[in-house]
């Protein structure tokens, strides 16, 4: 297992809300990607393939979620002080070989100015 | 523990159908990929068929197509193959196999775990 | 289809010898999606390796693969009794994915 810090802005805050980034390499074809607080597992996004170029999406833990061809962007939504934490995007490479597992993660500050709904 | 348990072989006439069932235990199904591969009676490995996670891809060999279907009930824990218009050549030990890594893919990925596999006899 | 084809068919050697095994593909096999299986008498085959050189969970460290393209090598660096078996090498790169027709290592 590979650990590291995001090399890249991992979090994007808008309207209240933020949307976490979680990047794999372009050659990667099939994958699981977990969105990590801490230990806990907050949501995951399978992306694989199979005959005819078919590609399946699964999520077993539903999110608000977007893929890209190199991204996976979780979104958390009525950001309050109690989502300041860790997060840590959790890849897992099924496709090409060999089988990986890399941690990458940041923490995310949680600021008046990023509140929904703040009462002036 | 991993379990696979194939049944539902047996012996019987060419043009005949039969329907195999592959039942999984000791891992969460739904994860995984699977895949028929079979064994000619001293021969050597065949791939048949593959399914990914919800069913909804599936693939077979040239030889196969057309007369095998592949199906799983996720909810039973199961694996099917219905087999028909059967041929002498189709005499083998069947084997459901499950993909390595669980990425829910029987496509390029390698298998772990076999079953013991069920005999299909065809035969006049 | 990609064809694979395995030599030797037979390879005698005793306890504490090396064994390589070879497989070569009619063509190219993509990102290496290749594996070796062992298959002993009246048993389901067991993964060894996939990814032509990755030790899959549990395999003695006796075990490695090799190579790329349509050139690959199973490696046993120093046969153990229970190693005695059929090997057969599997591509599931390209649809319809194959098996070779094995090698069988045996007591010399």
């Known amino acids: 297992e590979i650990n590291g810090s995001a090399n890249y802005e991992m979090f994007i805050f808008h309207n209240g809300g933020v949307q976490i980034l979680c990047k794999y390499p372009d050659i990667v074809q099939q994958f699981k990607m977990q969105l990590l607080k801490g230990g806990q597992i907050l949501c995951d996004l399978t992306k694989t393939k199979g005959s005819g170029n078919t590609v399946s999406i699964k999520s077993l833990k539903f999110c608000h979620s977007q893929l890209s061809n190199n991204s996976v962007s979780f979104f958390l939504y009525n950001l309050d002080h109690s989502h300041a934490n860790y997060y840590f995007c959790n890849l897992s490479i099924f496709d090409p070989p060999p089988f990986k597992v890399t941690l990458t993660g940041g923490y995310l500050h949680i600021y008046e100015s990023q509140l929904c709904c703040q009462l002036k | 523990e991993v379990q696979l348990v194939e049944s539902g072989g047996g012996v019987i006439r060419p043009g005949g159908s039969l329907r195999l069932s592959c039942a999984a235990s000791?891992?969460?199904?739904?994860?995984?990929?699977m895949s028929w591969v079979r064994q000619a009676p001293g021969k050597g490995l065949e791939w048949v068929s593959g399914?990914?996670?919800?069913?909804?891809?599936?693939d077979y060999a040239d030889s196969v197509k057309g007369r095998f279907t592949i199906s799983r009930d996720n909810a039973k824990n199961s694996l099917y193959l219905q087999m028909n218009s059967l041929r002498a050549e189709d005499t083998a030990l069947y084997y459901c196999?499950?993909?390595?890594f669980g990425s829910g893919s029987y496509y390029n990925v390698p298998f772990d775990y076999w079953g013991q596999g069920t005999l299909v006899t065809v035969s006049s | 289809e990609i064809v694979l084809t395995q030599s030797p068919g037979t390879l005698s050697l005793s306890p504490g010898e090396r064994a390589t095994l070879s497989c070569r593909a009619s063509q190219s096999v993509s990102s290496s999606y290749l594996a070796w299986y062992q298959q002993k008498p009246g048993q389901a085959p067991r993964l060894l390796i996939y990814g032509a050189s990755s030790r899959a969970t549990g395999i003695p460290d006796r075990f490695s693969g090799s190579g790329s393209g349509t050139d690959f090598t199973l490696t046993i660096s120093r046969l153990e009794p229970e190693d005695f078996a059929v090997y057969y090498c599997?591509?599931?790169?390209?649809?319809?994915?194959?098996f070779g027709p094995g090698t069988k290592v045996d007591i010399k």
């Open positions: 196999a499950r993909d390595y």
């Open positions: 000791g891992f969460t199904f739904d994860d995984y990929g």
């Open positions: 599997h591509q599931y790169g390209n649809s319809p994915f194959t």
């Open positions: 399914i990914n996670w919800i069913g909804d891809n599936t």
